[in-house]
Interface confidence: low
C-alpha cells in the first residue's frame, strides 16, 4: 500500500520561496505523481505531473495558472513556488498512483505571511471641547499591506484603551479592512472618545499587531500625538512677576511685570485693570495676561486686578483676582544743618536727619564708619577738636534690599589752639653740655588752623606739616648753649580765637670738655 509524507501546513513569508514535499513511503519502481490546486470554487486544476520509471522522473507542467514565476517540480517531485504571494494561499493536493500498491492523496495548506508597513496615525487637528457630552473623533490609524489582516489597538499614556466597537457616548472604535490589488490587507481604525480636562497632557498612539510563521507575532507602534483641547477656566492666578521682594515690595523706578494666568484653553482674553475709588481703570486687554509697568512710581501703588474673559466657565468660578502693588521708595535725605557745621569748642548741638519713604525707613548715624546711634537725631555735646570730621546719616529699607540713601555734613570745631610738645633725646637736668644737639617738636590743633612760631630761630625750624586728626607740627633742631639754659625756648600756636605757649627749659648746661 502506498503512503505519502506531506506536511499538512506550510508557512512562508511573502517573497520567499517554498517547497511542498510529497514523498511516497516504501519502494516503488513505477508510480505516477500529480499536484492539484484547490481553488475557491472547489475545482481542482492539475498543476503538474511526474512519472517515476526506475530512478528517473519524467516531469510535465500542466496549468501554471498564469503564476509568475511559474510553478516548478524538482527532481524529487516536490512542488516549488518561487517568491510566494498572498494569492498562493491555497490547499495543494498531491496524488500518487502506484499501480497494484494503490493510490494515495494528501493535502498541504500554504499560509503566506506579510508584515504590514509602518503604522500611520492621523490625529484630529481641530480643537476638541471637553464640554461635549458624547464621544468625538480622536484619530484614525492605518496599517497597510499585511497578511493576515492586522489588528489595531489604541493607547493612552502607554495604557491600552479598552473601547468597544459599538457606539457609546464614552468611547468606541470603528474598523474597516480593505483587500488591496496585491491581495494584501489594509486595516483602518478610528477612535472616538469623550474627552476630559486631564486629556490635555495625555499622549495617544495606536499599534498594529500582526502574525508571523510558527505562531510568532509582531507589533508596529505609530508615533504618539497630543490633542488640542478646549476647556473652560477653573482657576485664575495673578501675581507680581519680577522683581519683587519676599515681602511683596517693588522698587520705585523698576520695570515691573504683573502676570495673570487662567488655566483654560485656548488662552482666553485677559483684562488688566486698576481699582481706584471702586472704579475699574482698564490698563490693557491681551491674550498673554501680562502687564508691564515701566519705571514704576509710588503713585502706581494700589490695587490691580485681572479678569479672565471666559464665557464658558462655570458660574461658581472666580474669574477675577486682585493684588496690592506696593511701590517702595526712598527720597533724598535732608539734614537740619547744611553741608558744613561750624561750632565753638565745648558747645552742644542737635542735627536732625529727615526721611520720606515706604516702607518706614531705618536711620543710623556714623562717623568714620563707627556707629553713633539709630534714629533721626544726632546729639553733639561738649564737643572737642576730636569731634571734627564727617558725619553720615544712612537710611535703608530693611524689607527692600538695595534701596538706601546717605547724606553727610562736616563738623568744624572753632577754638583757640591745643598744644603738644616733645623733645628728641631729652636729658635730665644738669646733663646737657654746651654744643649738644636737640630737636624740639611742637604740635597744635584748632580752627582755623593755628600758626606755629618759635621764640628763637638760632636753630633750623622745619616747615610745619599737617598730621592726623587736625594736628599741625613744627620741629626745631638746635645746639644747646648756656644762654638757652638761662632763657629757654618758647613755641607759640595762635589763631583768631587765642594762643598757647610752651617754654622748653634745659637746666644747667656744662661747658664743652676737650677730648684726650
Amino acid at each position: 500500500e502506498v503512503r505519502l509524507s506531506v506536511p499538512p501546513l506550510v508557512e512562508v513569508m511573502r517573497g520567499k520561496s517554498v517547497i511542498l514535499d510529497c514523498t511516497p513511503t516504501g519502494t516503488h519502481d513505477h508510480y505516477m505523481l500529480e499536484w492539484f490546486l484547490t481553488d475557491r470554487s472547489g475545482a481542482r486544476p492539475r498543476l503538474a505531473s511526474a512519472e517515476m520509471q526506475g530512478s528517473e522522473l519524467q516531469v510535465t507542467m500542466h496549468d501554471t495558472r498564469g503564476r509568475s514565476p511559474p510553478y516548478q517540480l524538482d527532481s524529487q517531485g516536490r512542488l516549488v513556488l518561487a517568491e510566494a504571494q498572498v494569492g498562493d494561499e491555497r490547499d495543494y493536493v498531491c496524488v500518487v498512483r502506484a499501480g497494484a500498491a494503490g493510490t494515495a492523496e494528501a493535502t498541504a495548506r500554504l499560509n503566506v505571511f506579510a508584515k504590514p508597513e509602518a503604522t500611520e496615525v492621523s490625529p484630529n487637528k481641530g480643537t476638541l471641547s471637553v464640554m461635549e457630552d458624547s464621544a468625538q473623533e480622536i484619530a484614525t490609524c492605518n496599517s497597510r499591506n499585511g497578511n493576515p489582516a492586522p489588528k489595531i489597538t489604541w493607547y493612552r499614556n502607554g495604557q491600552r484603551l479598552e473601547v468597544p466597537v459599538e457606539m457609546n457616548p464614552e468611547g468606541y472604535m470603528t474598523s474597516r479592512t480593505v483587500r488591496e490589488a496585491s491581495g494584501l490587507l489594509s486595516l483602518t481604525s478610528t477612535l472616538y472618545l469623550r474627552l476630559r480636562k486631564d486629556d490635555r497632557d495625555a499622549s495617544f498612539h495606536c499599534a498594529a499587531h500582526y502574525s508571523l510563521p510558527e505562531g510568532r507575532h509582531g507589533r508596529l507602534d505609530s508615533p504618539t500625538f497630543h490633542l488640542t483641547l478646549h476647556y473652560p477656566t477653573e482657576h485664575v492666578q495673578f501675581w507680581v512677576g519680577s522683581p519683587s521682594t519676599p515681602a511683596g515690595w517693588v522698587r520705585e523706578g523698576d520695570t515691573v511685570q504683573l502676570l495673570c494666568r487662567g488655566d483654560g484653553s485656548p488662552s482666553p482674553e485677559y483684562t488688566l485693570f486698576r481699582l481706584q475709588d471702586e472704579q475699574e481703570e482698564v490698563l490693557n486687554v491681551n491674550l498673554e495676561g501680562n502687564l508691564t509697568l515701566e519705571g514704576v512710581t509710588r503713585g502706581q501703588s494700589g490695587t490691580y486686578g485681572c479678569r479672565v474673559e471666559d464665557y464658558d466657565a462655570a458660574d461658581d468660578v472666580q474669574l477675577s483676582k486682585t493684588l496690592e502693588l506696593r511701590v517702595a521708595y526712598l527720597d533724598p535725605l535732608e539734614l537740619s544743618e547744611g553741608k558744613v557745621l561750624s561750632l565753638p569748642l565745648n558747645s552742644s548741638a542737635v542735627v536732625n536727619c529727615s526721611v520720606h519713604g515706604l516702607p518706614t525707613p531705618a536711620l543710623r548715624w556714623t562717623k568714620d564708619s563707627t556707629p553713633l546711634g539709630d534714629g533721626p537725631m544726632l546729639s553733639l555735646s561738649s564737643i572737642t577738636f576730636d569731634s571734627n570730621g564727617t558725619y553720615v546719616c544712612e537710611a535703608s529699607l530693611p524689607t527692600v534690599p538695595v534701596l538706601s540713601r546717605t547724606q553727610n555734613f562736616t563738623l568744624l570745631v572753632q577754638g583757640s589752639p591745643e598744644l603738644k610738645t616733645a623733645e628728641i633725646e631729652p636729658k635730665a637736668d644738669g646733663s646737657w653740655r654746651e654744643g649738644d644737639e636737640v630737636t624740639l617738636i611742637c604740635s597744635a590743633r584748632g580752627h582755623p588752623d593755628p600758626k606755629l612760631s618759635w621764640s628763637q630761630l638760632g636753630g633750623s625750624p622745619a616747615e610745619p606739616i599737617p598730621g592726623r586728626q587736625g594736628w599741625v607740627s613744627s620741629s626745631l633742631t638746635l645746639k644747646v648753649t648756656s644762654a638757652l639754659s638761662r632763657d629757654g625756648i618758647s613755641c607759640e600756636a595762635s589763631n583768631p580765637h587765642g594762643n598757647k605757649r610752651h617754654v622748653f627749659h634745659f637746666g644747667t648746661v656744662s661747658p664743652q670738655t676737650s677730648q684726650a
Partner: nanobody
C-alpha cells in the same frame, strides 16, 4: 526713560492735509493705548484722538470726527495722525501722549502720563 518725539507739523492752507508722526521709545509701545492732544495759543489742552494697544479700536473728539484718522505701527513703535480738511481752528501745538483707557460707567476716558515736546500745526491762508 519714556521718550516721545513728534514730527510732521508745519504751515498749511485751509482745506489742506498733514500727517503727524510720533516715534516712541523707553517703554513697551505695543502694550499701551496712545493719544493725540493739542493746545491752541492761550487755551488749555484738548484731547483729539486715542487708539488702543492693538490698533483695532479708535475714538475721536467731535471737533475732528470724519477729518482726522489715528493709526499706529507697533513694529516701528510709531503713532500717526492723518489730518485732512484742515481748518484755522485746528491751529495748535499737537502732542503725542502715552495713554490708557478708563471706563467709568459707560463713558471712556483717555488719561495720559507722558507727553512729547509737541509739533506746531498752523492752518492759515
Amino acid at each position: 526713560q519714556v521718550q516721545l518725539v513728534e514730527s510732521g507739523g508745519g504751515l498749511v492752507q485751509p482745506g489742506g492735509s498733514l500727517r503727524l508722526s510720533c516715534a516712541a521709545s523707553g517703554f513697551t509701545f505695543s502694550s499701551y493705548a496712545m493719544s493725540w492732544v493739542r493746545q491752541a495759543p492761550g487755551k488749555g489742552p484738548e484731547w483729539v484722538s486715542a487708539i488702543n494697544s492693538g490698533g483695532g479700536s479708535t475714538s475721536y473728539a467731535d471737533s475732528v470726527k470724519g477729518r482726522f484718522t489715528i493709526s499706529r505701527d507697533n513694529a516701528k513703535n510709531t503713532l500717526y495722525l492723518q489730518m485732512n480738511s484742515l481748518k484755522p481752528e485746528d491751529t495748535a501745538v499737537y502732542y503725542c501722549a502715552k495713554s490708557w483707557t478708563v471706563r467709568i460707567g459707560q463713558i471712556y476716558h483717555h488719561p495720559t502720563d507722558y507727553w512729547g515736546q509737541g509739533t506746531q500745526v498752523t492752518v492759515s491762508s
